[in-house]
Interface confidence: low
Amino acid sequence: QGGTRSPRCDCAGDFHKKIGLFCCRGCPAGHYLKAPCTEPCGNSTCLVCPQDTFLAWENHHNSECARCQACDEQASQVALENCSAVADTRCGCKPGWFVECQVSQCVSSSPFYCQPCLDCGALHRHTRLLCSRRDTDCGTCLPGFYEHGDGCVSCPTSTLGSCPERCAAVCGWRQ
């Protein structure tokens, strides 16, 4: 058959790759490679990722685990999912807050901070979007309020003075 070894790994199962001299079984997710196998088709020596580190995929070459990120409380971030040996911490914003990217071209790994969603109700406006950033994202004035300048003003309840059109239900009947 000649003296050259086939570069293909003729081992049972497909999770083998050539590491050093032999085809070795890789390490499962959450483990790093301590030492390659010492016989063909053997098992590599794999150690579990230490605390605060992870490896998300099966691998044949990672001799270290990646550091888990910590969510930045000063940026109002919270951990949506805690770090485990097989997955990084997933940082995000708590309900009622939205992600504001710190760089102009935002990708999933970009640094970010959390901003509170605008409370349209506190502005006496309908909530048009799930999370509004500006008051212009809010809807029209709530019943009992009318547009005046930039805001919503409570409809007059007295019979004195005029009754704005939007307030007919509140003060119109008294006119």
């Epitope: 790093y32 230490p50 605060d52 550091r67 990120q69 000063q74 940026a75 971030q77 640094p111």
Partner: antibody, heavy 121, light 115 residues
Framework: EVQLVESGGGLSQPGNSLQLSCEAS????????LNWVRQAPGKGLEWVAY????????SYADAVRGRFTISRDNAKNSLFLQMNNLKSEDTAMYYC??????????????WGQGTQVTVSS | QPVLTQSPSASASLSGSVKLTCTLS???????IVWYQQRPDKAPKYVMY???????SKGDGIPDRFSGSSSGAHRYLSISNVQSEDDATYFC?????????????FGSGTKVTVL
């Protein structure tokens, strides 16, 4: 306001020990990885040691491995560097530096003002 | 051991501009680096991180006069409209993990003199 305040430096003889402390305030201490970095007089910066947020990962520069020990007390917002068997080449200003960690990038974003360690006979 | 190379000095005229270079050794060629400013007898101050694609993010209070760019194994820090307070030593640094050891390497620093 983020603050890191080092203490414990001073004059020591070769072979002796010192313990440096770094007291932190203005941020959630337990969320952040921390480092010690030193600077010999008139020289550049030299990384000394690293400790992860929950002390699960610790690393040392070759020059101090086996002599220095980094540790932290998250309950007291404090970082420590125990320095044993001091040598004259350990003479430097020692800074503690915070790693923001959450960015997924390595970056020492806040530094203390430093504490001076002088090793001389 | 990874190496970051910086030229020892650079000068800039007041209101002029200056561009500092940090060259990464092959092990670090794709790495993000960080620029630090150190004024005499002060602690280093975080200026910005700078990725291999040139994207960067500045630290708090760093003026718009400071910008970063990248080309291959080179990382640049540019200062335009140079002011007297920019007179300082600028270090580049990179965090890395090698053989299951985490560490930092720093360049030797570039002393910027404002004329």
């Amino acid at each position: 306001e983020v603050q890191l305040v080092e203490s414990g430096g001073g004059l020591s003889q070769p072979g002796n020990s010192l313990q440096l402390s770094c007291e932190a305030s203005g941020f959630t201490f337990s969320n952040h990885d921390l480092n010690w970095v030193r600077q010999a007089p008139g020289k550049g910066l030299e990384w000394v040691a690293y400790i992860s947020s929950a002390s699960g990962l610790i690393s040392y520069a070759d020059a101090v491995r086996g002599r220095f020990t980094i540790s932290r007390d998250n309950a007291k917002n404090s970082l420590f560097l125990q320095m044993n068997n001091l040598k004259s080449e350990d003479t430097a200003m020692y800074y503690c530096a915070r790693d923001p960690a959450y960015t997924g990038l390595y970056a020492l974003d806040f530094w203390g003002q430093g504490t001076q360690v002088t090793v001389s006979s | 051991q990874p190496v970051l190379t910086q030229s020892p000095s650079a000068s800039a005229s007041l209101s002029g501009s200056v561009k500092l270079t940090c060259t990464l050794s092959s092990e670090l060629s794709g790495f993000t680096i960080v620029w630090y400013q150190q004024r005499p007898d002060k602690a280093p101050k975080y200026v910005m991180y700078l990725k291999s694609d040139g994207s960067h993010s500045k630290g708090d209070g760093i003026p718009d006069r400071f910008s970063g760019s990248s080309s291959g194994a080179h990382r640049y820090l540019s200062i335009s409209n140079v002011q007297s307070e920019d007179d300082a030593t600028y270090f580049c640094g990179a965090g890395y993990t090698l053989a299951n050891q985490y560490g930092w390497v720093f360049g030797s620093g570039t002393k910027v003199t404002v004329l």
